[in-house]
Interface confidence: medium
């Protein structure tokens, strides 16, 4: 988790002087409770937005927006703590809005936004807005939380972001898998425009079951420049195992921008309606 760039972040608006500060996610009001505290945020909304860094890179960001309740407690509102928690890693990042002037009621509801939390593709976050000071122990909570799921790199807008492009999102291998005679599969896919190797993982499953009954790895050496964007054809020999008839082919590239962590593409071959009688394995069959 990180903030987009480190340029000055602003939260001021007409009628309010405000500054954005880094936060330890442990506001002082936890340790030194106040008697009078503001009410909770209203209508917290989280949306996926996209923002460019100063270097021109495009990143997905969480656009956080909320409003204030129209009660007298805004007189005691000193700011807000924004917290983003990445659910699969428990990593948390916070910022604090510090109000430098007192809020006053005006003709329309106060609204706040913040769009500088960079989020990762295919990750879920919990976003919390805490009004400050935080409530006394056993006091009514004055925060609001919402979960936010970021789409993966298949999503049209996500595909062109820097993190997705770095992981190979623009490569469309257009995989085709054809069943041949003698327990073989022909896998065909389009190579990308980079001289890097690929790995094909064949995983076979019994009909209607999800534990794998066979797995085999096939290494494809780096193509030469004249082979870029060409189709690569690979014949995989299957093990003649009873009922092991559903095959998933997964292709993993090793692009320089993502190394071992590039997006993988897969295709599946279903079990035939009427499985053929198994034939004996030829002696020359390679051992997986």
């Amino acid at each position: 988790l990180r903030l987009l760039d480190h340029r000055a972040l602003v939260c001021s608006q007409p009628g309010l002087n405000c500054t954005v500060k880094n936060s330890t996610c442990l506001d002082d009001s936890w340790i030194h409770p106040r008697n009078l505290t503001p009410s909770s945020p209203k209508d917290l909304q989280i949306q996926l937005h996209f923002a460019h860094t100063q270097q021109g890179d495009l990143f997905p960001v969480a656009h956080i927006e909320w409003t204030l309740q129209t009660d007298a407690s805004i007189l005691y509102l000193e700011g807000a703590e924004l917290s983003v928690l990445q659910l699969n890693t428990n990593e948390r990042l916070c910022v604090r809005f510090e109000f430098l002037s007192k809020l006053r009621h005006h003709h329309r509801r106060w609204r706040f936004t913040f769009s500088h939390f960079v989020v990762d593709p295919d990750q879920e976050y919990e976003v919390t807005v805490h009004h400050l000071p935080k409530p006394i122990p056993d006091g009514d909570p004055n925060h609001q939380s919402k979960n936010f799921l970021v789409p993966d790199c298949e999503h049209a807008r996500m595909k062109v972001t820097t993190p997705c492009m770095s992981s190979g999102s623009l490569w469309d291998p257009n995989i085709t898998v054809e069943t041949l005679e003698a327990h073989q599969l022909r896998v065909s896919f389009t190579l990308w425009n980079e001289s890097t190797h690929y790995q094909i993982l064949l995983t076979s499953f019994p009909h209607m079951e999800n534990h794998s009954c066979f797995e085999h790895m096939h290494h494809i050496p780096a193509p030469r420049p004249e082979e870029f964007h060409q189709r690569s054809n690979v014949t995989l020999t299957l093990r003649n195992l009873k009922g092991c008839c559903r095959h998933q082919v997964q292709i993993q590239p090793f692009f320089s921008s993502c190394l071992n962590d590039c997006l993988r593409h897969s295709a599946t071959v279903s079990c035939p309606e009427m499985p053929d009688t198994p034939e004996p394995i030829p002696d020359y069959m390679p051992l997986w």
Epitope: H211, S212, M217, H219, L241, Q250, I281, D283, W288
Partner: antibody, heavy 116, light 107 residues
């Protein structure tokens, strides 16, 4: 050269758990799965299960389902086999072996003794 | 599960003689069968896979044959280092299963 080196002998009480490690070297760890086979004293070989070092897929022997967990740590090229709720008849030498179907390299074995 | 039955349980052979070990599957395992040799206090050593293919470094005196349900491991001329227990193993279907073993001892 290919080597599978297992952790040392263990003595456990009934109901406890044991976790045996198997460190691979001499080849690309994620290219081949790791299988686990055990052998009770004076008895034959019994297949326990297999884990894919690439995808994490597992396939366990039915009789051990719910008690056995196989994991890998690709950063250290190490496979682990944990067996829970140990009974006296789990006393055996536990072997890790390379590959899923036919085992071409074996660890030296880890003796696990279950005794009260 | 597929039951693998090995016979005989013990085979007494003199050095230099031929030894024939049998392995029978309760149902067809095609050619998905391996043979292993195990000496006391050691891990099993692979000898044969796919019923008849010798593993790396295995001497030519070891040969495997058969398909379907009946398989044979033949040691053409027994050497002193060949006295051990031999196991067959099928990998045609889950769970993978081993035979009970044949002990080859010096006559």
């Amino acid at each position: 050269q290919v080597q599978l080196v297992q952790s040392g002998a263990e003595v456990k009480k009934p109901g406890a758990s044991v976790k045996v490690s198997c460190k691979a070297s001499g080849y690309t760890f994620t290219r081949y799965g790791i299988s686990w086979v055990r052998q009770a004293p004076g008895q034959g070989l019994e297949w326990m299960g297999w884990i894919s070092t690439y995808s994490g897929n597992t396939n366990y022997a039915q009789k051990l389902q719910g008690r056995v967990t196989m994991t890998t740590d690709t950063s250290t090229s190490t496979a682990y086999m944990e067996l829970r709720s140990l009974r006296s008849d789990d006393t055996a030498v536990y072997y890790c072996a390379r590959r899923q179907l036919y085992f071409d390299y074996w660890g030296q074995g880890t003796l696990v003794t279950v005794s009260s | 599960e597929i039951v693998m039955t090995q016979s005989p349980a013990t085979l007494s052979v003199s050095p230099g003689e031929r030894a024939t070990l049998s392995c029978r599957a309760s149902q067809s395992v095609s050619s998905n069968l391996a043979w292993f040799q195990q000496k006391p206090g050691q891990a099993p050593r692979p000898l044969i896979y796919d019923a008849s293919t010798r593993a790396t470094g295995v001497p030519a005196r070891f040969s495997g044959s058969g398909s379907g349900t009946d398989f044979t491991l033949t040691i053409s001329s027994l050497q002193s280092e060949d006295f051990a227990v031999y196991y067959c193993q099928q990998y045609d279907n889950w769970p993978l299963t081993f035979g009970g073993g044949t002990k080859v001892e010096i006559k």
